[in-house]
């Protein structure tokens, strides 16, 4: 892609580069305890870690961003680790008519890349 | 969206929060001077700036990421400023058979959000 090839091996050491990590959170943590009923505890996969040069680049823009960050670090930020895809979850809500199941398509990350 | 409402006014002051900024780069900067013929100078729109709580949240995931970053800053990173859309650009390439025009759909950012 654009004569720059993204790489998948982390040069910073294991677990340091952009990856998916599970964070446990309660509805209280999220401020949702008054309107989501269940489950009260969620396993939230999130994208964490650094984005060294060419690591898991999302696209051409990310590749040139990495390059320009090397040249102008004060002006151009390094790419950062964000979700590339999501996995849906279902939550039980209190509604006017009782309880309903609602799907969230963009709550839990499924994959990560550097953008 | 999920009872947390993203906001569009920057609490850090003008120009500090996630926004689109134009960066001028030469083909030499990008390492493309051997295979891209024209233009020699590119205006590259990139996403820069901070993502304070709820600012331009991309989706539900970004909203909860901001919330959890407030509770566990060492574990959960703050959302970061990345492209929400791109604008295509055309570059003139040197090819085996001469010169061709190639469109890049993901080279120049058109909008930014916090993800």
């Amino acid at each position: 892609s654009a004569h720059l090839h993204p790489r998948d091996s982390c040069p910073l050491g294991p677990g340091r580069c952009c990856h998916l990590e599970t964070v446990q959170a309660t509805l209280e943590d999220l401020g949702w305890s008054d309107w989501v009923l269940s489950p009260r505890q969620l396993q939230l996969s999130m994208c964490v870690g650094e984005c060294p040069h060419l690591y898991r680049s999302a696209n051409t823009h990310a590749l040139i961003k990495a390059r320009l960050h090397g040249l102008q670090p004060d002006r151009v930020p390094a790419p950062c680790c964000v979700p590339s895809s999501y996995t849906p979850v279902v939550l039980m809500h209190r509604t006017d008519s009782g309880v309903s199941l609602q799907t969230y398509d963009d709550l839990v990350a499924q994959g990560c890349h550097c953008a | 969206s999920a009872h947390l409402h993203p906001r569009d006014s920057c609490p850090l002051g003008p120009g500090r929060c996630c926004h689109l900024e134009t960066v001028q780069a030469t083909l030499e900067d990008l390492g493309w001077s051997d295979w891209v013929l024209s233009p020699r100078q590119l205006q590259l729109s990139m996403c820069v700036g901070e993502c304070p709580h709820l600012y331009r949240s991309a989706n539900t995931h970004a909203l909860i990421k901001a919330r959890l970053h407030g509770l566990q800053p060492d574990r959960v990173p703050a959302p970061c400023c990345v492209p929400s859309s791109y604008t295509p650009v055309v570059l003139m390439h040197r090819t085996d058979s001469g010169v061709s025009l190639q469109t890049y759909d993901d080279l120049v950012a058109q909008g930014c959000h916090c993800a």
Partner: antibody
Framework: QVQLVQSGAEVKKPGASVKVSCKAS????????INWVRQAPGQGLEWMGW????????NYAQKLQGRVTMTTDTSTSTAYMELRSLRSDDTAVYYC????????????WGQGTMVTVSS | DIQMTQSPSSVSASVGDRVTITCRAS??????LAWYQQKPGKAPKLLIY???SLQSGVPSRFSGSGSGTDFTLTISSLQPEDFATYYC?????????FGGGTKVEIK
């Protein structure tokens, strides 16, 4: 490990009521809901309703509305299902089951309680 | 209410056979479908959730696929302990509903 343990078998007369208990262990009881599902002899599974252990909010199957009540006691991590005005076609094995979780999974089931309705 | 239609209602198969069971929802249920195995006198056991995710501890010969209205449970190589009744279940909306079941019998 996560477990749901139900009360023992019951024999009831038509018109009577039955109350089945389901004691949870191995997880935070208030983090999940409890479903009640029944299975008549030789038949398939029929969902009766759901209760959140946290707040007591319920959702009952329409055909049982008015005859069924589901409750929880958080101090003992126990869920209860009471069925009133019993009829012979209420004869079934009654199961409690934890869920749905965030992936709509009903993952842990009790061993079942046989309720026989006979005159 | 969402109706869940399972087919076939029974299947005769031999050890080592590949067995496929289908489940159709009367309306779209996204990927909110689960598969259960039940043996006589026992409670149902969760095999697959979210249409294709294998429950922890379940052998990898079980797999699920599909989304929307059409779903499949596949047992790649039937083992003696797999002879049982299988149910699909939707949890896209209340009331939660089950399919009628598929009995996998020894040929």
């Amino acid at each position: 490990q996560v477990q749901l343990v139900q009360s023992g078998a019951e024999v009831k007369k038509p018109g009577a009521s039955v109350k089945v208990s389901c004691k949870a262990s191995g997880y935070t009881f208030t983090s999940y809901g409890i479903n009640w599902v029944r299975q008549a002899p030789g038949q398939g599974l029929e969902w009766m309703g759901w209760i959140t252990a946290y707040s007591g909010d319920t959702n009952y199957a329409q055909k049982l509305q008015g005859r069924v009540t589901m409750t929880t006691d958080t101090s003992t991590s126990t869920a209860y299902m009471e069925l009133r005005s019993l009829r012979s076609d209420d004869t079934a094995v009654y199961y409690c089951a934890r869920g749905p979780g965030q992936y709509a999974d009903v993952d842990v089931w009790g061993q079942g309680t046989m309720v026989t309705v006979s005159s | 209410d969402i109706q869940m239609t399972q087919s076939p209602s029974s299947v005769s198969a031999s050890v080592g056979d590949r067995v496929t069971i289908t489940c159709r929802a009367s309306q779209g249920i996204s990927s909110w479908l689960a598969w259960y195995q039940q043996k006589p006198g026992k409670a149902p056991k969760l095999l697959i959730y979210a249409a294709s995710s294998l429950q922890s501890g379940v052998p990898s010969r079980f797999s699920g696929s599909g989304s929307g209205t059409d779903f499949t449970l596949t047992i790649s190589s039937l083992q003696p302990e797999d002879f049982a009744t299988y149910y699909c279940q939707q949890a896209n909306s209340f009331p939660i509903t089950f399919g009628g079941g598929t009995k996998v019998e020894i040929k």
